[in-house]
Interface confidence: medium
């Protein structure tokens, strides 16, 4: 237990969020970070994973309603599996119906997140900014 | 000290953010909430104050870089003082130079925040969504 050495007292009227990597956004106990540098999907995934996170996974409009207001397009962890035609997240879980509106912007097997819960299909090799996410336990 | 009754252990590799009102966004120990309902500036200010917060104050591009990616227009706490022509925050502090690009969209004495650190002048009576902010100590 040696890693745990700070004690924090929390007022009942408010609450702490996290824990998250330093200077990440914390919302409803999930951690998010928006990265400015443009990378292809694979390098974006590698960047997130090197920070003990994954590319954005959209699992709930309620718990992730902050995503409504995100400007521009950013890689998320959604990929097309050609063999069965489904869209799946990096961890292998299936995209739940009615969570995202999938729009075919380009031919491709990766998807960009855009505001108001839209997913734009894009070629995985195209450089884009990206969103990393870490779910707290 | 009766309000403080939760103890949290924090891993050194990560950190907690806050405290913030429940389900607010926490970033670099500031708390933010985006409100969907459209209100005029005065009602928006009252709404934030009733939650022990104020309308958004932009004080640092570095500490508030999450605001770069905010879509749409939202009331912030910036108001025009006709007597001296300056733009001030609710707390009376002057708008720092080079923080916001002020754009005259309408005749008015209030300002809407828009992505990439822009401020749009608007009539204070016009209904808009708004951003509340609470700075943690």
């Amino acid at each position: 237990n040696s890693l745990f050495n700070q004690e924090v007292q929390i007022p009942l009227t408010e609450s702490y969020c996290g824990p998250c990597p330093k200077n990440w956004i914390c919302y409803k106990n999930n951690c998010y970070q928006f990265f400015d540098e443009s990378k292809n999907w694979y390098e974006s995934q590698a960047s997130c994973m090197s920070q003990n996170a994954s590319l954005l996974k959209v699992y709930s409009k309620e718990d992730q309603d902050l995503l409504k207001l995100v400007k521009s397009y950013h890689w998320m962890g959604l990929v097309h599996i050609p063999t069965n035609g489904s869209w799946q997240w990096e961890d292998g879980s299936i995209l739940s119906p009615n969570l995202l509106t999938i729009i075919e912007m380009q031919k491709g097997d990766c998807a960009l997140y855009a505001s108001s819960f839209k997913g734009y299909i894009e070629n995985c090799s195209t450089p884009n900014t990206y969103i990393c996410m870490q779910r707290t336990v | 000290n009766s309000l403080f009754n939760q103890e949290v252990q924090i891993p050194l590799t990560e950190s907690y953010c806050g405290p913030c009102p429940k389900n607010w966004i926490c970033y670099k120990n500031n708390c933010y909430q985006f409100f969907d309902e459209s209100k005029n500036w005065y009602e928006s200010q009252a709404s934030c104050m009733s939650q022990n917060a104020s309308l958004l104050k932009v004080y640092s591009k570095e500490d508030q870089d999450l605001l770069k990616l905010v879509k749409s227009y939202h009331w912030m706490g910036l108001v025009h003082i006709p007597t001296n022509g300056s733009w001030q925050w609710e707390d009376g502090s002057i708008l720092s130079p080079n923080l916001l690009t002020i754009i005259e969209m309408q005749k008015g004495d209030c300002a809407l925040y828009a992505s990439s650190f822009k401020g749009y002048i608007e009539n204070c009576s016009t209904p808009n969504t708004y951003i509340c902010m609470q700075r943690t100590v």
Epitope: Y42, M49, S50, I81, E90, D91, G92 | -
Partner: antibody, heavy 121, light 107 residues
Amino acid sequence: QQLEQSGGGLVTPGGSLKVCCKASGFDFTTYWMTWVRQAPEKGLEWIGCIHGGDSGATYYANWVNGRFTLSRDIDQSTGCLQLNSLTAADTAMYYCARPGYPSWSKTFDLWGQGTMVTVSS
Amino acid sequence: DIQMTQSPSSLSASVGDRVTITCQASQDISNALNWYQQKPGKAPKLLIYAASTLQSGVPSRFSGSGSGTDFTLTISSLQPEDFATYYCQHSNSFPLTFGGGTKVEIK
């Protein structure tokens, strides 16, 4: 598409060894190369993975504790696992593996043939 | 770390039998679970990913089910080539972990 492993063999306790895995038939730079080991008559144990692209990002199991190091050579489409401070408990078959799709990192459909590492005095 | 508990550790069955192997995760992993088959002296072979999706080229007698923490691999009619050891593996997050394995032997 295949993964061809090399290296391995007999090493004394405290010694070091390098095991490598050459990829062919696919774009190495878009995949994660993963390493898994299996002690004699035991189950599979994940060691870690390295991204084949420019970032060369790595991820390790907690138990590795700095003793093992992953590296990769983009020009050679090769990933290597450097094993240091070896003990008898590290005696195992070491496998490299590749995910089923470039977009995955944790589901493996292509495996190397395995390389046996024996630690004994 | 997520622990994966597989049962039974071994079982004896005859050709034509229906065989069921279970795997339990120590926390909710949605459907992020894979099943592998391994024969002596060979590398593992992916059978099923995402809990229930059959890998290309794998016979349809293999099926997977489950979500959350409880998962099942079923072989509807055991064939001679199916005698092997089967492993589950979660793909939810790092570090990855495998179940202890289930050895399917001839009765």
